[in-house]
């Protein structure tokens, strides 16, 4: 059997196989050692007994999407049946005091591979016995502690495979310079040691994406905005836009990145090299926000002027260029890429990313201030608590709700939170009455809210002993 017979039905075209060469990966036309690594079809009854105590689940994730030329990292995590875990030696053990369907186990081990390897590898001083090999016959690399690695992971994509020895979690990084743009499929098959052979325990697949567009995301933050995720913001208060570029492999670390903003409110274009920008909308309505990100990224070099034709064709750089083209394969000249020649073959190419959002601007509470605090005299001679009136003004829209959070003087330990609807006139002047149990210094956070906004003000207040002569003070 060959690798492609074992590892999946996705058969890339000859063009894809030729032009998606992954560094360090091998062709899936290679032979698979079925004796050491048995192959089971889906639904084969043997899967049921491939692992003691249940099925192992493999979870495959990636940091896709990847900008072409950058590295994409795949991670596989094995999830064992309940009460099982991998110990420091790579053995699979039962968790202490954990009860599964079978009850508590007397044997601490699910799989004691340390004992197995000591038994089976004694025949050869090098430890390189015929079974310590991958499915294609390549020997296991002898990293320190490699004997504690009891799982064999076979990654398969684009007609190529990569083999890795590991523990219950592995990571593999692939450079995407030669990968065709668009969605691609990664398949992983996991085997475990079983005496002098291996047993399949899990298969998993996931789609990843390679793109020539810089993956861009914009977070928006505005003071007093009640819900930052609804793309509704307040008039007359600055919105902070922060551009996040998805670049987990730091491919663009040394690139100059330009940000070109159009806020959709006829304020023109704003160009910046800073990933954050503030903008204030002064009118209500719906606006179309557009951002274009431009980065000079490492890229393929344009082919040099053609030399005298050799007798035998050699692969040209055109094949490398193809990998950047999201259209169907064509000659290099079809590729509308901006290329700039830089000495010693480190060429750069301008990559672009786009972000568009429709944002709604509405009236909101812009500001809130406590302008006066008054101790309310009670009819009882020595009341247990103090009633305090906070006279509050606000600017902007009419609040519908007031909340007070009363806490300790550090403003960290909340003692009491009270929210209630308020009726406020157009002048936006209101009095909030709150009870304070006992004298002392309190931190008072007072927020006024409406449907779209939440404005906060804070003060420290010193509540005196209930001696009528002692006045109420703002502690700050």
């Amino acid at each position: 059997k060959r690798f492609h017979d074992v590892l999946g039905n996705e058969r890339p075209s000859a063009y894809m196989r030729e032009h998606n060469q992954l560094n360090g990966w091998s062709s899936d036309e290679n032979d698979w050692n079925e004796k050491l690594y048995p192959v089971w079809k889906r639904g084969d009854m043997r899967w049921k007994n491939s692992w003691k105590g249940g099925r192992v689940q493999a979870v495959l994730t990636s940091d896709s999407p990847a900008l072409v030329g950058s590295n994409i990292t795949f991670a596989v995590n094995l999830i064992f049946p309940r009460c099982q875990k991998e110990d420091a030696n790579g053995n699979i053990v039962y968790e202490k005091n954990c009860r599964n369907e079978a009850g508590l186990s007397a044997d601490p081990y699910v799989y004691n591979w340390t004992a197995w390897s000591e038994d089976s590898d004694g025949e050869n001083g090098t430890g390189q016995s015929h079974h310590n090999v991958f499915p294609d016959g390549k020997p296991f690399p002898h990293h320190p502690g490699w004997r504690r690695w009891n799982f064999i992971y076979v990654f398969h994509t684009l007609g190529q495979y990569f083999q890795k020895l590991g523990r219950c979690s592995v990571r593999v990084s692939v450079n995407t310079a030669n990968v065709t743009l668009g969605p691609q499929l990664m398949e992983v098959t996991v085997y475990r040691r079983h005496g002098r052979a291996y047993v399949p325990i899990a298969q998993v697949k996931d789609v990843y994406v390679v793109t020539d567009q810089i993956p861009v995301f914009v977070t928006m933050f505005q003071k007093n905005d009640r819900n930052s995720s609804d793309e509704t913001f307040l008039k007359d208060l600055p919105i902070m836009f922060d551009v996040l570029i998805h670049d987990p492999s730091h491919f663009l670390n040394y690139s100059t990145i330009n940000y070109k903003w159009s806020f959709g409110d006829n304020t023109g274009l704003f160009v910046s090299t800073n990933h954050t920008v503030n903008h204030t909308y002064v009118l209500n309505g719906t606006f179309s926000l557009n951002l274009t990100v431009k980065a000079a990224a490492p890229g393929p070099c344009p082919p040099p002027p053609p030399p005298p034709r050799p007798s035998k064709p050699t692969p040209s750089l055109a094949t490398t260029l193809k990998s950047y083209d999201s259209n169907t394969p064509g000659p290099a000249g079809d590729n509308p890429l901006e290329l700039s020649r830089i000495p010693d073959e480190n060429c750069q190419i301008n990559r672009y990313g786009h972000f568009q959002a429709t944002i709604t601007i509405v009236e909101g509470i812009l500001e809130v201030n406590i302008i006066q605090m008054t101790d309310v005299l009670m009819p009882v001679p020595w009341p247990e608590s103090s009633l305090i009136d906070f006279v509050v003004t606000c600017q902007g829209s009419i609040p519908t709700e007031v909340c007070t959070i009363i806490s300790d003087p550090t403003c960290e330990i909340t003692q009491n939170t009270v929210c209630s609807p308020v009726d406020v006139d157009e002048m936006c002047l209101l009095t909030v009455r709150r009870t304070f149990n006992g004298s002392g210094t309190y931190c008072v956070n007072l927020t006024l809210g409406d449907d779209t906004s939440l404005a906060l003000t804070s003060t420290l207040i010193s509540v005196p002993d209930r001696d009528p002569a002692s006045p109420l003070r703002m502690a700050n």
């Epitope: 309310v376 608590s385 009419i398 519908t400 709700e401 007070t404 009491n416 009270v418 929210c419 209630s420 609807p421 308020v422 009726d423 006139d425 157009e426 009095t431 009455r433 709150r434 009870t435 409406d450 449907d451 779209t452």
Partner: antibody, heavy 116, light 110 residues
Framework: EVQLLESGGGLVQPGGSLRLSCAAS????????MSWVRQAPGKGLEWVSS????????YYADSVKGRFTISRDNSKNTLYLQMNSLRAEDTAVYYC?????????WGQGTLVTVSS | QSVLTQPPSASGTPGQRVTISCSGS????????VSWYQQLPGTAPKLLIY???QRPSGVPDRFSGSKSGTSASLAISGLRSEDEADYYC???????????FGGGTKLTVL
């Protein structure tokens, strides 16, 4: 002069629906929160629901949550109460009132009778 | 069973001073304004006191409100026969997220 005029009350069978209206005049309706309060025959006052001036915030008594819906049309200066799945215990005079932290003006009420 | 507790009835003779109490908790009376409503027989309720002790214009100063801790009181001095009505206290309850009323006090002028 502030005026609140309720309408839409009447006799309805259990499980039935009714929509009450409250026409407001004499003040800038869109600047005020509005509420519904009811009073069963011979009983005390029971708050039913309140809505903010813009209609974005709504509160309901537990006894009507999921069955009643408060709404408003500021262009028509009208407050509504849509009552579904009515029960015998919803029988009451329904008052429309201005504001929600206190009720400073009240309508004359409309009687809703739920009976088979 | 009302969240705010009022005596079911109270009485007094003309000219006398009568007090009606209203008891609650820190989530309503303790931290929110109390209002008092008067309901004359066969009519809609009318606001008598708001913000614990404030009188709307047109309400005689014979009516006064006060609050201490989690209790509130309505005092009517110089009682008149036209004061015979049901009186309700009310406040927002921040725990229930609801406006709550007392059960009402029937005032009889003897």
């Amino acid at each position: 002069e502030v005026q609140l005029l309720e309408s839409g009350g009447g006799l309805v069978q259990p499980g039935g629906s009714l929509r009450l209206s409250c026409a407001a005049s004499g003040f800038t309706f869109s600047n005020y929160a509005m509420s519904w309060v009811r009073q069963a025959p011979g009983k005390g006052l029971e708050w039913v629901s309140s809505i903010s001036h813009s209609g974005g915030s709504k509160y309901y008594a537990d006894s009507v949550k999921g069955r009643f819906t408060i709404s408003r049309d500021n262009s028509k200066n009208t407050l509504y109460l849509q009552m579904n799945s009515l029960r015998a215990e919803d029988t009451a005079v329904y008052y429309c009132a201005r504001k929600w932290s206190t009720f400073d003006y009240w309508g004359q009420g409309t009687l809703v009778t739920v009976s088979s | 069973q009302s969240v705010l507790t009022q005596p079911p009835s109270a009485s007094g003779t003309p000219g006398q001073r009568v007090t009606i109490s209203c008891s609650g908790s820190s989530s309503n009376i303790g931290n929110n304004y109390v209002s008092w409503y008067q309901q004359l027989p066969g009519t809609a309720p009318k606001l008598l006191i708001y913000a614990d002790s404030q009188r709307p214009s047109g309400v005689p100063d014979r009516f006064s409100g006060s609050k201490s801790g989690t209790s509130a009181s309505l005092a009517i001095s110089g009682l008149r026969s036209e004061d015979e009505a049901d009186y309700y206290c009310g406040a927002w309850d921040s725990s229930l997220n609801a406006y709550v009323f007392g059960g009402g006090t029937k005032l009889t002028v003897l």
